[in-house]
Interface confidence: low
């Protein structure tokens, strides 16, 4: 049967017989060995497996030069087989053997779970010599044991190339349950089932699990670890934890918050970055996401105009970056803009609406009835036109841009002139004789330059030719402008 030592506050003196300090007064119990010349080694039986021959820790002495008498078999004495103690306690255990003095240089090593313990372990070997034998006691001590000290410890001794192995000493460090898996925070859909997992280990086993929701126990009947709690669904945020119990006491896991996914809060602080005649760049700060990642956002645009039909333009965009360029807007118009974002649950309310305006646009039509004729006496070209019919959105007319291109013998030169908004005629100096002059005119507002009129060409002859006939823009639908000389 296994000898089992239960926990005490003191370290254990775990070799049988008297303490080393008393060996001087009484050797018999620890060192008495039969010395009869006819001694034959008998089978020994393992304390851990009764009835099975056990020879693993026995060395059969050889015949020596001192004579032919057989020495007894060498074996470690039986000691405590199982030590159970709590974390942070100190423990000391040992193994002992009596070795005939004919053997020299005996050393004992300690092994744990098949690996030799080297270095900074507290192992002490003491020798107690007598006339014929030496008692050897190897002690091993651990201060403030941890769970990692759990395992099977043995002594090994080498004699004459034979290895003698002690019975194992099992160290079991017990403590409060230790979590190997704790519940995790989750964001869940309202009234939808979900699972939480909790796992803890000893020793001592078993470890029983209780679940706690908002400070109240969920299960009055504990479950053996590991435990999976299936929550059928929640309607509001809850905090869950699990309690792990064993014979040593209770450990409580971290509390985890289970959030209920909801529609997001509306975006805040919608800002205008810049606006052009037909676009407005906005940004916003996302609201709280409702415990579910944003999927996309919707920019809603209403024209603020008593005459508009009040319809809302909707532009869908990704949730990030939190910016959007609203396009296809009318020039010089006022708009009310709001932003809403959605997650898997649904759309947020619309942000506070902000007002924004587009700037003036460029004119959409060119000046009309452009005519060009040569005033040879002044050596200039006279240009006339009619003011275009611009829409209000184009803004206030600030002037005209005149393009005149001079082409002669493979050379081409374009010049630009700007004239004020009150003008409907202009004169430009002749740049080249014996050349073609092509004239186009565009209206200009603060919003930009409008389209150029169709080109009107006039031939500038060499000096001495006379021409007073104008060239003009054709009526709509006509072919290319006609050059009149």
């Amino acid at each position: 049967a296994i000898t089992e030592a239960r926990e005490e506050a003191k370290p254990y003196p775990l070799f049988p017989g008297p303490l080393p300090g008393s060996l001087q007064t009484d050797h018999t119990s620890l060192l008495s060995l039969p010395h009869t010349s006819g001694y034959q080694p008998a089978l020994m039986f393992s304390p851990t497996q009764p009835g099975r021959p056990y020879t693993g820790n026995v060395a059969i002495p050889r015949v020596t030069s001192a004579g032919s008498k057989l020495l007894p078999p060498l074996a470690f004495k039986h000691t405590v087989g199982h030590i159970i103690l709590s974390e942070h306690k100190d423990v000391k255990f040992n193994c002992s053997i009596s070795v005939p003095n004919i053997y020299q240089d005996t050393t004992i090593s300690w092994w744990k779970d098949g690996k030799e313990l080297l270095g900074a372990h507290h192992a002490i070997t003491q020798f107690y010599p007598d006339d014929e034998v030496t008692a050897i006691i190897a002690s091993f001590s651990i201060t403030s044991v941890q769970r990692s000290d759990n395992g099977s410890y043995i002594c090994k001794m080498k004699i004459n190339n034979e290895e003698i192995v002690s019975d194992p000493i099992y160290i079991e460090v017990q403590g409060l349950p230790h979590f190997t898996k704790q519940p995790e925070s989750m964001n869940v859909t309202r009234n939808t089932a979900f699972n939480l997992t909790c796992q803890a280990v000893g020793p001592p086993e078993p470890v029983n699990i209780f679940w706690v929701q908002n400070s109240s126990r969920v299960n009055e009947q504990p479950e053996k670890s590991p435990s999976v709690l299936t929550v059928p669904g929640l309607t509001e945020m809850a905090v869950f934890s699990c309690e792990a119990h064993n014979d040593k006491g209770l450990t409580v896991s971290k509390g985890v918050q289970i959030n209920i996914k909801a529609i997001p809060s509306p975006p805040t602080e919608v800002s205008i970055h810049n606006s052009t005649a037909h676009s407005i760049l906005i940004s916003w700060v996302p609201g709280f996401d409702g415990y579910s990642p944003f999927r996309n956002c919707s920019v809603q645009v209403k024209e603020v105009d008593p005459l508009s039909n009040g319809s809302v333009m909707i532009f869908n965009t990704s949730a990030s970056p939190h910016m959007y360029q609203i396009k296809q807007l009318q020039a010089l118009a006022n708009y009310s803009i709001g932003v809403s974002c959605m997650n898997e649950i649904g759309w947020s309310a619309v942000s506070p609406w902000i007002l924004a305006s587009t700037t003036e646009g460029a004119p959409s039509v060119a000046p009309l009835n452009v005519t060009v004729f040569l005033n040879e006496s002044r050596d200039n070209v006279d240009i006339r036109w009619m003011k275009p019919l611009t829409k209000r959105q184009a803004g206030e007319l600030v002037g005209y841009r005149i393009s005149h291109v001079w082409q002669s013998a493979g050379i081409s030169k374009e010049l630009l002139e700007e004239v004020g908004q009150n003008n409907s005629r202009a004169q430009i100096s002749v740049q080249v004789h014996n050349a073609t002059c092509t004239v186009r005119i565009a209206a200009v507002t603060k919003g930009g330059v409008g389209p150029f009129s169709d080109p009107v060409k006039i031939f500038i002859p060499a000096h001495g030719w006379v021409d007073h006939a104008p060239s003009s823009t054709p009526a709509p639908g006509n072919a290319d402008p006609v050059l009149i000389i």
Partner: antibody, heavy 118, light 107 residues
Framework: QVQLQQPGAELVVPGASVRLSCKAS????????MHWVKQRPGQGLEWIGE????????NYNQKFKDKSTLSLDKSSSTAYMQLSSLTSEDSAVYYC???????????WGQGTTLTVSS | QVVLTQSPAIMSASPGEKVTITCSAS?????MLWFQQKPGTSPKLWIY???NLASGVPARFSGSGSGTSYSLTISRLEAEDAATYYC??????????FGAGTKLELK
């Protein structure tokens, strides 16, 4: 409580690259954008960029677009910023900062002092 | 990008004095944030949405402004207020931009 942990210092040679880390704890990592800010000794603050841990989408200050790369490890709730082709101009304190739902940089790391020197 | 110009760059004031730091934006922004930074420490959010005090900020601080002009005011300066203050905008972004900072010292 919310914490952003950054290594105290990094020393690198010119021309090399470095990856700065920012380990977040005390809140749900994927719910908040992470920003990075540079501060040269005795100077002001410069915004480098931001990254959304839910989908790794990043915005950069154009000035730092070629210099920095933002990334994440969701499993360890850690944000990273890689800085490449380092010069002495990159010697600075680099902060990570959490951005809350309302666009506020509400929690900042202690900053990593990067020294670029041969 | 929006450039934020803080003034003054450095100022010195006595305890009990009223102190105002201004922040001018190169184009209109819809709100302003302010941070406080003391030597060797990270910046701290101090004021957000132009006028709201962050958690733990004493009531002697206030913020105001609109458009391109914003300010941070301390009604009665205390020793612990000595620090560098930065304004920050994110109306026009990216990039987020900061002012160059105002160093407030005690006389």
């Amino acid at each position: 409580q919310v914490q952003l942990q950054q290594p105290g210092a990094e020393l690198v040679v010119p021309g090399a690259s470095v990856r700065l880390s920012c380990k977040a704890s005390g809140y749900t990592f994927i719910n908040y954008w992470m920003h990075w800010v540079k501060q040269r000794p005795g100077q002001g603050l410069e915004w480098i960029g931001e990254i959304d841990p839910s989908d790794s989408y990043a915005n950069y200050n154009q000035k730092f677009k070629d210099k920095s790369t933002l990334s994440l490890d969701k499993s360890s709730s850690t944000a990273y910023m890689q800085l490449s082709s380092l010069t002495s101009e990159d010697s600075a304190v680099y902060y990570c900062a959490r951005c809350d739902y309302y666009g506020r940089l509400d929690y900042w790391g202690q900053g990593t002092t990067l020294t670029v020197s041969s | 990008q929006v450039v934020l110009t803080q003034s003054p760059a450095i100022m010195s004031a006595s305890p009990g004095e009223k102190v105002t730091i201004t922040c001018s934006a190169s184009s209109s922004v819809s709100y302003m944030l302010w941070f406080q930074q003391k030597p060797g420490t990270s910046p701290k959010l101090w004021i957000y949405s132009t006028s709201n005090l962050a958690s733990g900020v004493p009531a002697r601080f206030s913020g105001s402004g609109s458009g391109t002009s914003y300010s941070l005011t301390i009604s009665r300066l205390e020793a612990e207020d000595a620090a560098t203050y930065y304004c920050q905008q994110r109306s026009s972004y990216p990039p987020i931009t900061f002012g160059a900072g105002t160093k407030l010292e005690l006389k």
